[in-house]
Interface confidence: low
């Protein structure tokens, strides 16, 4: 599927370039596995240029294929602390709303490690809200070089 | 923040596309935790197109948001060799000069693994020099498919 | 090396933007370590826009520098299952044809983990076929959020 003639000659602004890199704000209350994110120059090196935050969750504002990436490091962690739990700590990135498009995009378990990091290409649509669910009893580090979450629009 | 009208219609060359993928050259002397990188077609599949090397460290020549990625594999490594050290081997990628902009961008520990890999989006400015510090007693593999470091300019 | 004047003003279609994200179809027969991939909207969130599949292997149709990324999660896996094997389970992504360009691009071992994920920038040429070889006795998960493989054209 190639770009249509109309798309080809448009100025770059119309092509998107939506991009965001977020840092961890806080975890959710007891029964809420979601991580809550924040972004903006005042906070350091995080930013939102196109996407927006809705109660700590990332909302997409432009259709397209995105590169989604994440790194989460567990705080107060050693290989024994991750391995001694019967149910391993798991991170899942997915579309959580609208409910009709709910799907898990990316899932990783920590096993005997204290950091997970991955990335993938995925189509996202305007209005998709991405949630990052951390299940297990261990808490994530809020250090901005250890835990971050971002998206980059790469093509229509 | 959208592209200004002036930026939108410029030829692609002026928009950057700076990119580099480096392979490990050598580690530093005793008290220097930095990894020293090299790049160029004669070396294999590494390259620099825009950024440059300054004594084995990567220097940015164009302002923008970059995707920074790295993979480091430890040589002569097993899960026991990484876990038996009291202080885990850690890799940190950061801006090391100019000193006024010094900051850690990306940090990972090996714990019971022998490879770390991650990526993140970050704003970088012309003149920023990126350093990759490997702390601990274990040495990195120089195999070009196991250890590499790269940046890709993604937008102004 | 900058874009030539001729390249700079071309419509975006001619600049490439080739992209693919694949999901695991099946593993190979006994002596074939390759993973076989599939992609297309009917299968979920996988797609091919430019590259093509040849018997489950990804073939490049446009010269350029690509970001190659992969995540593979082992099925029925625990840290003990990965660590108790004398030869660790290893994943390698490489150019497997044409034979004259055969090379390993990206290699990771699972050690005590159950998931590997990484990415790298690499020059690829029209006709290059990428193979992903999983060596060892453990099998990969076919869950689309746990195992995926993709490429993204990023510049000429």
């Amino acid at each position: 599927q190639r770009l249509s003639r109309a798309q080809q000659q448009l100025p770059l602004e119309s092509l998107g370039w939506d991009i965001a890199e977020l840092q961890l704000n806080h975890t959710g209350p007891q029964q809420d596995p979601r991580l809550y994110w924040q972004g903006g120059p005042a906070l350091g090196r995080s930013f939102l240029r196109g996407p927006e935050l809705d109660k700590g969750q990332l909302r997409i504002r432009r259709d397209g294929i995105y590169m989604v990436h994440i790194q989460v490091t567990l705080a107060i962690c050693s290989s024994t602390s991750t391995s001694r739990h019967h149910h391993p700590t798991t991170l899942a990135v997915g579309i959580c709303s609208p409910a009709s498009r709910s799907i898990s995009l990316l899932r990783l378990s920590f096993h005997q490690g204290c950091t997970i990091a991955s990335q993938r290409l995925t189509p996202l649509a305007r209005g998709d809200t991405l949630c990052t669910n951390l299940t297990g009893t261990l808490l994530p580090s809020r250090n901005t070089d250890e835990t971050f979450f971002g998206v980059q629009w790469v093509r229509p | 923040q959208r592209l200004s009208r002036a930026q939108q219609q410029l030829p692609l060359e002026s928009l950057g596309w700076d990119i580099a993928e480096l392979q490990l050259n050598h580690t530093g002397p005793q008290q220097d935790p930095r990894l020293y990188w090299q790049g160029g077609p004669a070396l294999g599949r590494s390259f620099l197109r825009g950024p440059e090397l300054d004594k084995g460290q990567l220097r940015i020549r164009r302002d923008g948001i970059y995707m920074v990625h790295i993979q480091v594999t430890l040589a002569i490594c097993s899960s026991t060799s990484t876990s038996r050290h009291h202080h885990p081997t850690t890799l940190a990628v950061g801006i090391c000069s100019p000193a006024s902009r010094s900051i850690s961008l990306l940090r990972l520990s090996f714990h019971q693994g022998c490879t770390i890999a991650s990526q993140r989006l970050t704003p970088l400015a012309r003149g920023d020099t990126l350093c990759t510090n490997l702390t601990g007693t274990l040495l990195p593999s120089r195999n070009t498919d196991e250890t590499f470091f790269g940046v890709q300019w993604v937008r102004p | 090396q900058r874009l030539s004047r001729a390249q700079q003003q071309l419509p975006l279609e001619s600049l490439g933007w080739d992209i693919a994200e694949l999901q695991l179809n099946h593993t190979g027969p006994q002596q074939d370590p390759r993973l076989y991939w599939q992609g297309g909207p009917a299968l979920g969130r996988s797609f091919l826009r430019g590259p093509e599949l040849d018997k489950g292997q990804l073939r490049i149709r446009r010269d350029g520098i690509y970001m190659v990324h992969i995540q593979v999660t082992l099925a029925i896996c625990s840290s003990t299952s990965t660590s108790r094997h004398h030869h660790p389970t290893t994943l390698a992504v490489g150019i497997c044809s044409p034979a004259s360009r055969s090379i390993s691009l990206l290699r990771l071992s699972f050690h005590q983990g159950c998931t590997i994920a990484s990415q790298r920038l690499t020059p690829l040429a029209r006709g290059d076929t990428l193979c992903t070889n999983l060596t060892g006795t453990l099998l990969p998960s076919r869950n689309t959020d746990e195992t995926f493989f993709g490429v993204q054209w990023v510049r000429p």
């Epitope: - | 050259n25 050598h26 090299q38 160029g40 004669a42 070396l43 084995g56 120089r142 | -």
Partner: antibody, heavy 122, light 107 residues
Amino acid sequence: QVQLQESGPGLVKPSETLSLTCTVSGGSVSSDYYYWSWIRQPPGKGLEWLGYIYYSGSTNYNPSLKSRVTISVDTSKNQFSLKLRSVTTADTAVYYCARGDGDFMGVCFDYWGQGTLVTVSS
Amino acid sequence: EIVLTQSPATLSLSPGERATLSCRASQSVSSYLAWYQQKPGQAPRLLIFDASNRATGIPARFSGSGSGTDFTLTISSLEPEDFAVYYCQQRSNWPLTFGGGTKVEIK
């Protein structure tokens, strides 16, 4: 275009020190990429690698000569030098300086000087 | 150290013929093998690096192949200027070593 030029005495007495300098033009010995090397070739025989120096001053020598050889670099003059101590007639050879392209585990040589014949004789 | 053995020591061929030169390593050097051409009174010239990559400015009639311990330099059709001595060299392990050379002479 990178050019290398060897210079030094063509005759050295046994037990003395052979000293040669290589001047680099069209390129910098301070480059991150290259390993500045010395290679020799006895008359009618094959090539033998002696050692290299990197811009940082790190060196690597052929173990067969390690106790006798020193390579140094002068970045201000864009030169690097070879010293071979306690020479014997077996050290009579054409000595080449060359630029090594590769990495610290090994290089191949993409630019060479034209070579200088050094004869060890009393 | 890694010993490189070149064969044959001498190859007598006519212009236009195909030349096949062999280099065998005493242990694996992966693909880290280079080939050089040397003419009388001149310095060696790099032809091929890392087994199969032609150096800048080298004609397409020169090609290299092999990996591990067995390598081949092929000159598809000999030109008069190709008659020379050819050396292989490994950069897999220190010390760097060269083969003993193969002389390609006019028949």
